[in-house]
Interface confidence: low
Amino acid sequence: TQHGIRLPLRSGLGGAPLGLRLPRETDEEPEEPGRRGSFVEMVDNLRGKSGQGYYVEMTVGSPPQTLNILVDTGSSNFAVGAAPHPFLHRYYQRQLSSTYRDLRKGVYVPYTQGKWEGELGTDLVSIPHGPNVTVRANIAAITESDKFFINGSNWEGILGLAYAEIARPDDSLEPFFDSLVKQTHVPNLFSLQLCGAGFPLNQSEVLASVGGSMIIGGIDHSLYTGSLWYTPIRREWYYEVIIVRVEINGQDLKMDCKEYNYDKSIVDSGTTNLRLPKKVFEAAVKSIKAASSTEKFPDGFWLGEQLVCWQAGTTPWNIFPVISLYLMGEVTNQSFRITILPQQYLRPVEDVATSQDDCYKFAISQSSTGTVMGAVIMEGFYVVFDRARKRIGFAVSACHVHDEFRTAAVEGPFVTLDMEDCGYNIPQTDESTLMT
């Protein structure tokens, strides 16, 4: 799934101000394609540990075996640990499942660093804090891996929620969500609210747990504020979108918009950072450096290698700029923008010797495979993956981290011409050689 294992290093913190607000209306009439309103049974069904990804509880087999599964919109295989591993507390035991069916086929998924391989089969799968359905789904039983599972992460598998085109070993292996929609009445849509722990915590592992919601089949109004704005899914492989303009503190980066999407732009819950193509990254860092020039930071900080620390509670958020990405809208010549704060792109690092300090890593990094809107972006927003209408929606998350001066935003419409020209067309011959 892209170059390098893309699991989050830290999911970040989350929250909204303590504030007196009117209750939201959560019982609206259902709207196609997905039910809207209240999904209390699915709210808060994601968990995680500091930096190690968001996972949902799933059951596989008969009788059900419970596993925690990483939610990944940047890949398309449902793959679970199926053999003992030093980092796994539990694993899928196919021999104990009366409903397991062997597909007699192997799968091998190499990354730039690390890999996993396994055996394909099908079994009955359900999500306890999800829709009340059971589906027969393809499962890659991971028998060998290298640098894939994370010590102490508490998840034992990965749920690839993208499209069949990028499934391994090939696009004939139906992804889990396709199976779910085909076999049930669940609408072809899911939405994600990735949240953090709520405080800049560093006391203990328990406090460093994160949360969030994966609403399967609909949209829950209690998870966002304001309006949802939609951008078209350019092509159904990754969740590919088109960025048409980038601003740092309202100043246009003034690059050819093709550069923003070279060679693609995707929304990926399995990546921590906002990753930008080389030229865009360099221009963005130059602009962020200039905006925050009242304090000087080492080069290693901008490369994501070094921490910067401030005395607890004194992080100068105000010196760091907001970053706005303009996305192609649903109407011709219309775009909208999503704006994130330094509270999203400065990633708190917990395990430091000086617990009196608040320390951060810069969570924007360089990419050779296009723009990746990872957790840094997603933690600011409630993100609707409306597969039925081939679009992705963004609204301000009710749990994003901010301060008393600024908040993340989703705003529009803006007039933007020739947006189609912003998409990059990957040469057909190159696609089959893309390393996951």
């Epitope: 101000p17 607000r21 609210q193 709520g198 405080f199």
Partner: nanobody, 125 residues
Framework: DVQLQESGGGSVQAGGSLRLSCAVS????????MAWFRQAPGKEREGVAG????????YYADSVKGRFTISQDNAKNTVYLQMNSLAPEDTAIYYC??????????????????WGQGTQVTVSS
């Protein structure tokens, strides 16, 4: 860090009312769930009422529905628990808690990462 300080506890006759307050100080900007818990002698701590700040949604334990009301005052950074029609079984130490978790486990103790010291409520018959 976040500090929580409860007040308003005391002794009251059955059928009476009390209003508990929880003052929140410190790093308050990212709190989005507040709750009241209570612990009666010899019993486990239980969730009584919770409020989810972004939507103002309130949650109550069945045992207090219709009698207790949780509310918040942004200007004072304070969360309140108005307790009416008190009964002897409401006698307990009442704790205020804050967390970043969401709604489905709002009345569960796990995940709350800031707690007050507690305030005693005694209801006599």
């Amino acid at each position: 860090d976040v500090q929580l300080q409860e007040s308003g506890g005391g002794s009251v006759q059955a059928g009476g009312s009390l209003r508990l307050s929880c003052a929140v100080s410190g790093y308050t900007y990212n709190i989005y769930t507040m709750a009241w818990f209570r612990q009666a002698p010899g019993k486990e701590r239980e969730g009584v009422a919770g409020i989810y700040s972004p939507g103002g949604t309130t949650y109550y334990a069945d045992s207090v529905k219709g009698r207790f009301t949780i509310s918040q005052d942004n200007a004072k950074n304070t969360v309140y628990l108005q307790m009416n029609s008190l009964a002897p079984e409401d006698t307990a130490i009442y704790y205020c808690a804050a967390r970043g978790g969401l709604l489905s486990r709002v009345l569960k103790e796990a995940g709350y990462n800031a707690w007050g010291q507690g305030t005693q409520v005694t209801v006599s018959s």
